[in-house]
């Protein structure tokens, strides 16, 4: 379904009161940092493309961000605009296309060779009581529900994937590392270009679950190289 294709753990989308996208179908997916996109107009064809009004980036498609169509334009009139490619100027992560993020005012690639997505180095560090102060929602897991005997739940800090409970992996989120869900069939995944290289994505996705591999979605073969959508598919 469209929902399962769109749903990803790169970063989570906001509840309707915050995200302002209650009427949109689908979930969020983002390889672009800082951004979440419920629905948006990504799946409209060019022929029936209409400027999509928005209040914030979450309301736009994966390859879009929310801004005034004219430079220095009225902030009250904002639409979803096409994301900016590598080396283009940016003012926030949302403006950069998937696989890039905004650093020092320029969209830069999220790929850096020195980082491996699933860091399995042997760090001999014991976990003590570690209580984060983020709270406020009825269903929550904080960064820090780690104890000696428990495996980290979603949102718990981690050093390696073995620190996380079953079905979770240890991945980067912003500048920290937390347990995130392993991807299920149909979910968007990140295909890294070189074997053994995991991108330094500011919002890093987990790998595909058992029996699944990250492959180009069949109906996206015709798309341009940069915009091919990879999803977790059965071997």
């Amino acid at each position: 379904t469209l929902n399962s294709v769109l749903n990803s753990n790169a970063i989570k989308n906001l509840p309707p009161p915050l995200g302002g996208a209650a009427g949109h179908p689908g979930s969020a997916v983002s390889a672009a940092p800082g951004i979440l996109y419920p629905g948006g107009n990504k799946y409209q064809t060019i022929d029936n493309y209409q400027p999509y009004p928005c209040a914030e980036d979450e309301e736009c498609g994966t390859d879009e961000y929310c801004a005034s169509p004219t430079r220095g334009g009225d902030a009250g009139v904002q639409i979803c605009l096409a994301c900016r490619k590598r080396r283009k100027r940016c003012m926030r992560h949302a403006m950069c296309c998937p696989g890039n993020y905004c650093k020092n005012g320029i969209c830069v690639s999220s790929d850096q060779n020195h980082f491996r997505g699933e860091i399995e180095e042997t760090i001999t560090e014991s976990f003590g009581n570690d209580h984060s102060t983020l709270d406020g929602y009825s269903r929550r897991t904080t960064l820090s529900s780690k104890m000696y005997h428990t495996k980290g739940q979603e949102g718990s800090v981690c050093l390696r994937s073995s620190d996380c409970a079953s079905g979770l992996c240890c991945a980067r989120h912003f500048w920290s590392k937390i347990c995130k869900p392993v991807l299920k069939e149909g979910q968007v995944c990140t295909k890294h270009r070189r074997k053994g290289s995991h991108g330094l994505e500011i919002f890093q996705r987990c790998y595909c679950g058992e029996g699944l591999s990250c492959r180009i979605q069949k109906d996206h073969h015709q798309a341009s190289n940069s915009s091919r959508l990879h999803t977790c598919q059965r071997h």
Partner: antibody, heavy 125, light 107 residues
Framework: QVQLVESGGGVVQPGRSLRLSCAAS????????MHWVRQAPGKGLEWVAV????????YYADSVKGRFTISRDNSKNTLYLQMNSLRAEDTAVYYC??????????????????WGQGTTVTVSS | EIVLTQSPGTLSVSPGERATLSCRAS???????LAWYQQKPGQAPRLLIY???GRATGIPDRFSGSGSGTDFILTISRLEPEDFAVYYC????????FGGGTKVEIK
Amino acid sequence: QVQLVESGGGVVQPGRSLRLSCAASGFTFSSYGMHWVRQAPGKGLEWVAVILYDGSDNYYADSVKGRFTISRDNSKNTLYLQMNSLRAEDTAVYYCAREGIAVAGDYYYYGMDVWGQGTTVTVSS
Amino acid sequence: EIVLTQSPGTLSVSPGERATLSCRASQSVSSSYLAWYQQKPGQAPRLLIYGASGRATGIPDRFSGSGSGTDFILTISRLEPEDFAVYYCQQYGSSFTFGGGTKVEIK
């Protein structure tokens, strides 16, 4: 308990250097992004720099880029800020802060959830 | 960079009254990454609200946050003596920026 303690502040002449430290305890330091934030006397908060959990990536405010260096030693649970070519406008209380991420239902949220008490840097001739 | 403008600069309110603090961004900000902090004289800032509306641990329910896009609000429903302080909003877009702060003082 979760605690951050800054040290290394003091009075220094313009153009000179200073290194601040932030000792972390009570949490898994090596999994968290860490920040430096400063506050000039009588002014608001200004973000200075952030470093990735493993020290392999960092990011600076334009005002300090090329002069300040953020680093960390995860084996010592310590964050550092090396400040070179100091200017009068760098005079401030410097805080280290921990990046926090919460998961609520299907959503991730962000905030600087733990702060140190601050260390004062005065740049004066 | 994204500029956050807080208003008013100073808010004079009597204890027990409601206080409404505004934070306006120069461009759209993801609600996920909009936070509010409280700072008292001589103390470090304290996280109050994250994700525009989520209360941090130990924060009383008289504090609430709302808003999306470019306009965000921090509301203190009934001011207690200990609430008189400076309040900052903060975002993470491409860089981390704080608003200039709103001082809530006793009327």
